[in-house]
């Protein structure tokens, strides 16, 4: 008889999840030779151990600590790029500017990017039918807790000048409820981080407003300043040109503003 399975509101575990995580890990050690000592089988075992057989609304950051330990990596000072609601452009940027890193350029972020997973209490099975939705079911689900855990660690280890890319097309350019606003901002270490520089990315070609004056950016400035970290803000009026100029900084058109 088929066993009763809890129905959650979110989509189920990504198909071929174990194979995908393992293949990504192996690929990462290939592309990032400095991580060649990483044992991908152990990484998968630790990942699995964080959520398998556990009630998927009762996952804790502690559950992910063995995985976090195995995936320990440091980013050079001044090379951390955070982002909020503008993942694709942030990733396009680090693909060109290879010495800067988003969380998804690090091993653990790379493993989990765009994947969903959850298990079931008291069984060794992965639930491919449904997983808890953050809003409709619970916030302490395997995916949300994972990103909270690794985002906290990523922010804690940042040093020098930290950059953040923000989406200027959104009603809340800085959103206190985003991972950046609720986790990363509060885990930057003032003794290691001298400044946070926000890049506000404009959406419309004709948008010439100074979005650094937006009330939510002022709110971000206030939070950061209270933490004894300096704050800077830049408008990126033309994201297409911005990327082009990162690729070809000598281009004559790059001497004017972007």
């Amino acid at each position: 008889l088929p066993r009763w399975r809890q129905q959650w509101s979110g989509s189920g575990t990504t198909s071929r999840f174990p194979e995908t995580v393992l293949a990504r890990c192996v690929k990462y050690t290939e592309v990032h030779p400095e991580m060649r000592h990483v044992d991908c089988q152990s990484v998968w075992d630790a990942f699995k151990g964080a959520f398998i057989s556990k009630y998927p609304c009762n996952i804790t950051e502690e559950d992910y600590q063995p995985l976090v330990k195995l995936g320990t990596q440091t980013v050079p000072c001044n090379k951390t790029l955070l982002w909020s609601r503008i993942k694709d452009l942030a990733h396009q940027f680090t693909q060109v500017q290879r010495d800067m890193f988003t969380l998804e350029d690090m091993l653990l972020g790379y493993l989990a990017d765009d994947l969903t997973w959850c298990g079931e209490f008291n069984t060794f099975e992965i639930n491919y039918q449904s997983c808890p939705d953050w809003r409709k079911d619970c916030s302490n689900n395997p995916v949300s807790v994972f990103w909270k855990t690794v985002s906290r660690r990523f922010a804690e280890t940042a040093c020098g000048v930290v950059h953040v890319m923000l989406n200027g097309s959104r009603s809340k350019i800085f959103d206190k409820n985003s991972t950046f606003g609720s986790v990363e901002v509060h885990n930057l270490q003032p003794e290691k981080v001298q400044a946070l520089e926000a890049w506000v990315i404009h959406g419309g070609r004709e948008d010439s407003r100074d979005l650094c004056q937006d009330p939510t950016i002022k709110e971000l400035e206030s939070i950061i300043s209270k933490r004894n970290i300096r704050f800077f803000c830049k408008n990126i009026y033309r994201p297409d040109k911005f990327l082009q100029c990162v690729k070809n900084p000598e281009d004559s058109s790059c001497l004017s503003g972007i």
Partner: antibody
Framework: QVQLQQSGPELVRPGTSVKVSCKAS????????VEWIKQRPGQGLEWIGV????????NYNEKFKGKATLTVDRSSTTAYMHLSGLTSDDSAVYFC???????WGQGTTLTVSS | DIVMTQSQKFMSASVGDRVSITCKAS??????VAWYQQQPGHSPKQLIY???NRYTGVPDRFTGSGAGTDFTLTISNIQSEDLADYFC?????????FGSGTKLEIK
């Protein structure tokens, strides 16, 4: 337990080619990259290249491009290194090794002589 | 390619002594350095990864240190079985490169 078992010694003529094998056991073959290293007496160690057994993708030391070709057979969990256009400079011990925990094969001695 | 220089070709020590084998990289390799021991007639055995992490089963007499361009393998309380060649290797960028080796002799 993890083992990398390499093929036996080879004595070959200059200008010919040879294929050295490295049979992996005791672990999931596609979960770890396999690298190849050359050691000539008194010459230290030289890194030849690495292969991802899952995808077949490779990275070579520029010095060994055109000389060494790395392949895998997933069904037999074996990695291979094909060496072509052999000269006396290719006489050496060749090792295969696994990423993570540094497991090495026992080495294959290649002698190129007329 | 990154050049790894082991300037000491030979080192001699008595049982119970402590020796430090050094390795210098031609450019910054972070901590992506491994140390290998090769006993006569054997395959190399990895002792240290990430400059200072010992592999399981490696005696704690072996200690790695350093970052950037300067690295050291220290062997304390030397035993007769430590007679071997010791190689450093950088794996920061392809192609990986090895030092030329340091032969440790036991007096």
């Amino acid at each position: 337990q993890v083992q990398l078992q390499q093929s036996g010694p080879e004595l070959v003529r200059p200008g010919t080619s040879v294929k050295v094998s490295c049979k992996a056991s005791g672990y999931a073959f596609t979960t770890y990259l396999v690298e190849w290293i050359k050691q000539r007496p008194g010459q230290g160690l030289e890194w030849i290249g690495v292969i991802n057994p899952g995808s077949g993708s490779t990275n070579y030391n520029e010095k060994f491009k055109g000389k060494a070709t790395l392949t895998v057979d997933r069904s037999s969990t074996t990695a291979y290194m094909h060496l072509s256009g052999l000269t006396s400079d290719d006489s050496a011990v060749y090792f295969c090794a696994r990423y993570a925990y540094g497991y090495w094969g026992q080495g294959t001695t290649l002698t190129v002589s007329s | 390619d990154i050049v790894m220089t082991q300037s000491q070709k030979f080192m001699s020590a008595s049982v119970g002594d402590r020796v430090s084998i050094t390795c210098k990289a031609s450019q910054n390799v972070g901590t992506a350095v491994a140390w290998y021991q090769q006993q006569p007639g054997h395959s190399p055995k990895q002792l240290i990864y990430s400059a200072s992490n010992r592999y399981t089963g490696v005696p704690d007499r072996f200690t790695g240190s350093g970052a950037g361009t300067d690295f050291t393998l220290t062997i304390s309380n030397i035993q007769s079985e430590d007679l071997a060649d010791y190689f450093c290797q950088q794996y920061s960028t392809y192609p990986f490169t090895f030092g030329s080796g340091t032969k440790l002799e036991i007096k």
